[in-house]
């Protein structure tokens, strides 16, 4: 399955929207930095496309879930958030279309299941951090910066998969 060129454009737009969502000076948030333990190894180049697409799908689904909460709506600009949802939704559709076309339809490798679980646990740590920080503006900025970094890393994987073909 070939992800459309619009998919990588959508990824760039997503990052741009995340950058625009910033609401306060980040310099006041330095002490709120946190190690969320992004499972970078789950996005390594050792994966075949069939194994990668469900992991990328999980990543984007979890980002969607994180920013769809009531607390998120209170933290960010509504117009930007709506555009952000639209971009994520389109990317989920692109990835789902690939799965339907037969990529990953065969018996799910255990490695892929472990990767999906690692991504879920990563987002659980992010959710717990926000809860512990009482969804403060700085906590949300730290999370936004983290999502920009992890989304960028996973997007780079998509690009490397495309270039290897």
């Amino acid at each position: 399955c070939d992800l459309p060129q619009t998919h990588s454009l959508g990824s760039r737009r997503t990052l741009m929207l995340l950058a625009q969502m910033r609401r306060i000076s980040l310099f006041s948030c330095l002490k709120d930095r946190h190690d969320f333990g992004f499972p970078q190894e789950e996005f390594g180049n050792q994966f075949q496309k069939a194994e990668t697409i469900p992991v990328l799908h999980e990543m984007i689904q979890q980002i969607f879930n994180l920013f769809s909460t009531k607390d998120s709506s209170a933290a960010w600009d509504e117009t930007l958030l709506d555009k952000f949802y639209t971009e994520l939704y389109q990317q989920l559709n692109d990835l789902e279309a690939c799965v339907i076309q037969g990529v990953g339809v065969t018996e799910t490798p255990l490695m892929k299941e472990d990767s999906i679980l690692a991504v879920r646990k990563y987002f659980q740590r992010i959710t717990l951090y926000l809860k512990e920080k009482k969804y403060s503006p700085c906590a949300w900025e730290v999370v936004r910066a983290e999502i920009m970094r992890s989304f960028s890393l996973s997007t780079n994987l998509q690009e490397s998969l495309r270039s290897k073909e």
């Epitope: 002490k31 709120d32 930095r33 910066a145 983290e146």
Partner: antibody, heavy 121, light 107 residues
């Protein structure tokens, strides 16, 4: 390969203005902050200030606030440090270094080679 | 501002020695402490970040420990290329601040 390349050494007279530069390459320039550090001859490191090139937000050390201006041009991946009126006490080596911002990653992991500024009448 | 105090300010040691440098913060900085090495005429080089994480490419003889206000940089077996000045720096809050430096000289 990540690189921060600084402009060359400068010799200036007291009262003159100066703008030195730090060009980033090999990484996404707007994803990291750029900090400036001063080292006077035979002395230690002093943090001057920092800029977020994505929107040019800045923070300064109280010791340097109002004495220097930090700016950036993200279109050419370059950060700047400038003086409107140099003093002899500004004679020092000036370094730029990248900072991961709010991400949990190494601070000041890459440094420029330094720009020596000499102010003498 | 958070003050960073290093000790000793200088020390003499021999190749193979175990060297320990300490850094104390004027208030708790959790684990937000970095260690740098600087050689004459060169830019500083990051050795340790977040108190104990070894920067990529740095030899394993360098290690860092501590949290709160008291931190330590240890060189388990000093090598000829380790003779330099070492700085700690807090990255907990602005303004960022450095220690005054510890010069490691040949005995």
């Amino acid at each position: 390969e990540v690189q921060l390349v600084q402009s060359g050494a400068e010799v200036k007279k007291p009262g003159e203005s100066l703008k030195i530069s730090c060009k980033g390459s090999g990484y996404s320039f707007t994803s990291y902050w750029i900090g400036w550090v001063r080292q006077m001859p035979g002395k230690g490191l002093e943090w001057m200030g920092i800029i977020d090139p994505s929107d040019s937000d800045t923070a300064y050390s109280p010791s340097f606030q109002g004495q220097v201006t930090i700016s950036a041009d993200k279109s050419i991946s370059t950060a700047y440090l400038q003086w409107s009126s140099l003093k002899a006490s500004d004679t020092a080596m000036y370094y730029c270094a990248r900072h991961p911002g709010l991400n949990w990653a190494p601070d000041f992991d890459y440094w420029g080679q330094g720009t020596l500024v000499t102010v003498s009448s | 501002d958070i003050q960073m105090t290093q000790s000793p300010s200088s020390l003499s040691a021999s190749v193979g020695d175990r060297v320990t440098i300490t850094c104390r913060a004027s208030q708790s900085i959790d684990g937000s402490l970095n260690w740098y090495q600087q050689k004459p005429g060169k830019a500083p080089k990051l050795l340790i970040y977040f108190a104990s994480s070894l920067q990529s490419g740095v030899p394993s003889r360098f290690s860092g420990s501590g949290s709160g206000t008291d931190f330590t940089l240890t060189i388990s077996s000093l090598q000829p290329e380790d003779f330099a000045t070492y700085y700690c720096q807090q990255s907990y809050d602005f303004p960022l601040t450095f220690g005054q430096g510890t010069k490691v000289e040949i005995k």
